[in-house]
């Protein structure tokens, strides 16, 4: 069964910078990835970026840079302009879609005990699965 993993990390050099890493574990090719925060896409979450493997990416503040790391994983750099680092308590969700077969989504957040620069362990929390 396909799965999605999500990792959130705080940059050691800039405490106001976060990076979300997401990956798809399963067969098939990915046709679209949506990253949202505050909850799953379409269920209270706000879109941060949409990535297409051929057509490029679209992103919205506070997303700074969205990019493909491999054919089945992406990263999204975030710039926190506020002083209180609200990202530390935020849930980030990644939805991987393979049109028209289905989509898979998981969410993750930075563990409260995380030290700057240390990556959070994979925390797949399946939200939505294709039939």
């Amino acid at each position: 069964t396909p799965e999605v993993w999500v990792q959130v990390q705080m940059e050691a050099t800039e405490l106001s910078s976060f990076t979300v890493h997401c990956g798809f574990l399963g067969p098939g090719s990915i046709s679209l990835v949506t990253v949202s925060w505050g909850g799953p896409d379409g269920a209270g979450g706000t879109k941060l970026a949409v990535l297409h493997p051929e057509l490029g990416t679209r992103q919205w503040a506070p997303a700074r840079q969205a990019r493909w790391e491999t054919q089945s994983s992406i990263s999204l750099a975030l710039e926190d302009s506020g002083a209180s680092s609200p990202f530390a308590n935020t849930t980030f969700c990644c939805k991987f879609a393979s049109f028209p077969e289905g989509s898979w989504e998981s969410c993750g957040s930075l563990p409260p005990s995380s030290d700057p620069g240390l990556s959070a362990p994979p925390t797949p929390v399946p939200i939505l699965r294709a039939d």
């Epitope: 090719s29 679209l32 379409g42 057509l55 049109f99 077969e101 289905g102 039939d131």
Partner: antibody, heavy 120, light 106 residues
Framework: EVQLVESGGGLVKPGGSLKLSCAAS????????MSWVRQTPAMRLESVAT????????YYPDTVKGRFTVSRDNAKNTLYLQMSSLRSEDTAIYYC?????????????WGQGTSVTVSS | QIVLTQSPAIMSASPGEKVTMTCSAS?????MFWYQQKPGSSPRLLIY???NLASGVPVRFSGSGSGTSYSLTISRLEAEDAATYYC?????????FGAGTKLDLK
């Protein structure tokens, strides 16, 4: 301007075959997933075939699987639907539609439709 | 496959009124779309991904919902809005449509 123009519809007897065409223009045809959607006399819409990845992957609902075949010729910017073993319930207006990736694969452009009547 | 149930099947409203129609899914939906179809014409995309307006669609149209419950709202009805409205989903194949809501003007 994006245009999709279907052709090939007509009257056919039950058990017969028909091949529909959809000529595309105004966009890079090979970059887009395409679908055939039919509208029954009761005005219900039903997706009957979808083709992606340059024609490698095709998808059909159970109602037409094994009877309909979707294909595309990217050099000719044309989408096809080969229909065989036709039944009266296949009577409908057949539309071709384009899926826009960044609109989450919504069908953002539709042709004008071609009518298929299956009757003895 | 996911079955979409639209309600009401037929509705009538006056120009200037606010109108809401719903689309209920038999199981949770990943992506929801709305189309408008006028007699003798092909369907036209109105809303993509639940709530985003397609190009050229007036701002009086809006979409909302999540999971299995979705709706399309027209804030101030105009004469040109008389049409049949269809919801459509893709979560896994096959792509499916609702039976439509026919909107007539009084």
């Amino acid at each position: 301007e994006v245009q999709l123009v279907e052709s090939g519809g007509g009257l056919v007897k039950p058990g017969g075959s028909l091949k529909l065409s959809c000529a595309a223009s105004g966009f890079t045809f090979s970059n887009f997933a395409m679908s055939w959607v039919r509208q029954t006399p009761a005005m219900r819409l039903e997706s009957v075939a979808t083709i992606v990845n340059g024609g490698i992957n095709t998808y059909y609902p159970d109602t037409v699987k094994g009877r309909f075949t979707v294909s595309r010729d990217n050099a000719k910017n044309t989408l096809y639907l080969q229909m065989s073993s036709l039944r009266s319930e296949d009577t409908a207006i057949y539309y071709c539609a384009r899926h826009d990736d960044f609109l989450y694969y919504a069908m953002d452009y539709w042709g004008q439709g071609t009518s298929v009547t299956v009757s003895s | 496959q996911i079955v979409l149930t639209q309600s009401p099947a037929i509705m009538s409203a006056s120009p200037g009124e606010k109108v809401t129609m719903t689309c209920s899914a038999s199981s949770s939906v990943s992506y929801m779309f709305w189309y408008q179809q006028k007699p003798g014409s092909s369907p036209r995309l109105l809303i993509y991904d639940t709530s985003n307006l397609a190009s050229g669609v007036p701002v009086r149209f809006s979409g909302s919902g999540s999971g299995t419950s979705y709706s399309l709202t027209i804030s101030r009805l105009e004469a040109e809005d008389a049409a049949t409205y269809y919801c459509q989903q893709w979560t896994s194949y096959p792509l499916t449509f609702g039976a439509g809501t026919k909107l007539d003007l009084k």
